[in-house]
Interface confidence: low
């Protein structure tokens, strides 16, 4: 079943390569377990950036080596992606799945274009 997912159109990463955005979904049911996946689309290639399954009211738990962190509040997920460089500029799509209880719902956002600008190197001082 389709579910509406909203996310910002554009986000600019910080000079430290950190980008944050909110992924909000219109939950048609009372889910107790939700899975959030961030996908990156660039040059028509889609790759999974990170994914987390969480219980409603609990923290998102990404894998230890994940570049993502996040928190949830109601039907909103606040996602932060770290370690970004200019080459990581692309469309980051939020995919939300209501895992339990049945029925299963799937929602895919339109994507957030994250722009990453590598910081200028500091000039050498005399």
């Amino acid at each position: 079943k389709a579910m509406h997912v909203a996310q910002p159109a554009v986000v600019l990463a910080s000079s430290r390569g950190i980008a944050s955005f909110v992924c909000e979904y219109a939950s048609p049911g009372k889910a107790t377990e939700v899975r959030v996946t961030v996908l990156r689309q660039a040059d028509s290639q889609v790759t999974e950036v990170c994914a987390a399954t969480y219980m409603m009211g609990n923290e998102l738990t990404f894998l230890d080596d994940s570049i993502c962190t996040g928190t949830s509040s109601g039907n909103q997920v606040n996602l932060t992606i770290q370690g970004l460089r200019a080459m990581d500029t692309g469309l980051y799509i939020c995919k939300v799945e209501l895992m339990y209880p049945p029925p299963y719902y799937l929602g895919i956002g339109n994507g957030t274009q994250i722009y990453v600008i590598d910081p200028e190197p500091c000039p050498d001082s005399d």
Epitope: T53, Y100, P102, P103, Y104
Partner: antibody
């Protein structure tokens, strides 16, 4: 290829507990839920419960007070423990895989016969 | 809980026959959340059809599923010797997941 291999048959006394294992291979354990289903002799199928790779579990209310489902991700093994056994728990216990996005079971273990008898 | 009632409970048929099994739900179940399984004696069930009408990979095309709401049907267009088994419907729309009581297809 995808396989779910269960532990061997058990004979138990009423009031005791049984723990059945289900070792998964041929797929990424973390991408799926493992369910447990039982079938009493000559009877139909009864869903017991499930565990996600996250460790969260959900149970059939009819068995919730007596069943515990766990998983060891390091060995891709799921476990189902049923306590306070009674004769009506005599059944073949199956583990089965369902993918995210559905609860239809595309692969099943071979089954484990648990006999409860005094 | 959603109760699933299959009919008939058992049937006798010959090789080549067209066989129809019905599964009736106690409340409406969207097509997406209904599956059919085949089980042979001493074996685990095998997924035949999911989402009411989608054939699982590797399942012969003589099996088909249809229906919506509370009434679903499994049809075997031309019964083969290996099709003599028990068939179960399953709903996964509401928890707990439930199965029909089964329909045994026997050789006439």
């Amino acid at each position: 290829q995808v396989q779910l291999v269960q532990s061997g048959a058990e004979v138990k006394k009423p009031g005791s507990s049984v723990k059945v294992s289900c070792k998964a291979s041929g797929f990424t354990f973390s991408g799926y839920a493992i369910h447990w289903v039982r079938q009493a002799p000559g009877q139909g199928l009864e869903w017991i419960g499930q565990i996600y790779h996250s460790g969260s579990t959900y149970y059939n209310p009819s068995l919730k007070s007596r069943v515990t489902i766990t998983a060891d991700k390091s060995t891709s093994t799921a476990y189902m423990e049923l306590s306070s056994l009674r004769s009506e728990d005599t059944a073949v216990y199956y583990c089965a895989r369902s993918g995210y996005g559905g609860y239809d079971f595309d692969y099943w273990g071979q089954g484990t016969l648990v006999t409860v008898s005094s | 809980d959603i109760q699933l009632t299959q009919s008939p409970s058992s049937l006798s048929a010959s090789v080549g026959d067209r066989v129809t099994i019905t599964c009736r739900a106690s409340q409406s179940v969207p097509r997406r959340y209904l599956a059919w399984y085949q089980q042979k004696p001493g074996k685990a069930p095998k997924l035949l059809i999911y989402a009411a009408s989608t054939l699982q990979s590797g399942v012969p095309s003589r099996f088909s599923g249809s229906g919506s709401g509370t009434d679903f049907t499994l049809t075997i267009s031309s019964l083969q010797p290996e099709d003599f088994a028990t068939y179960y419907c399953q709903q996964y729309y509401r928890s707990p997941i439930t199965f029909g009581q089964g329909t045994k297809v026997e050789i006439k």
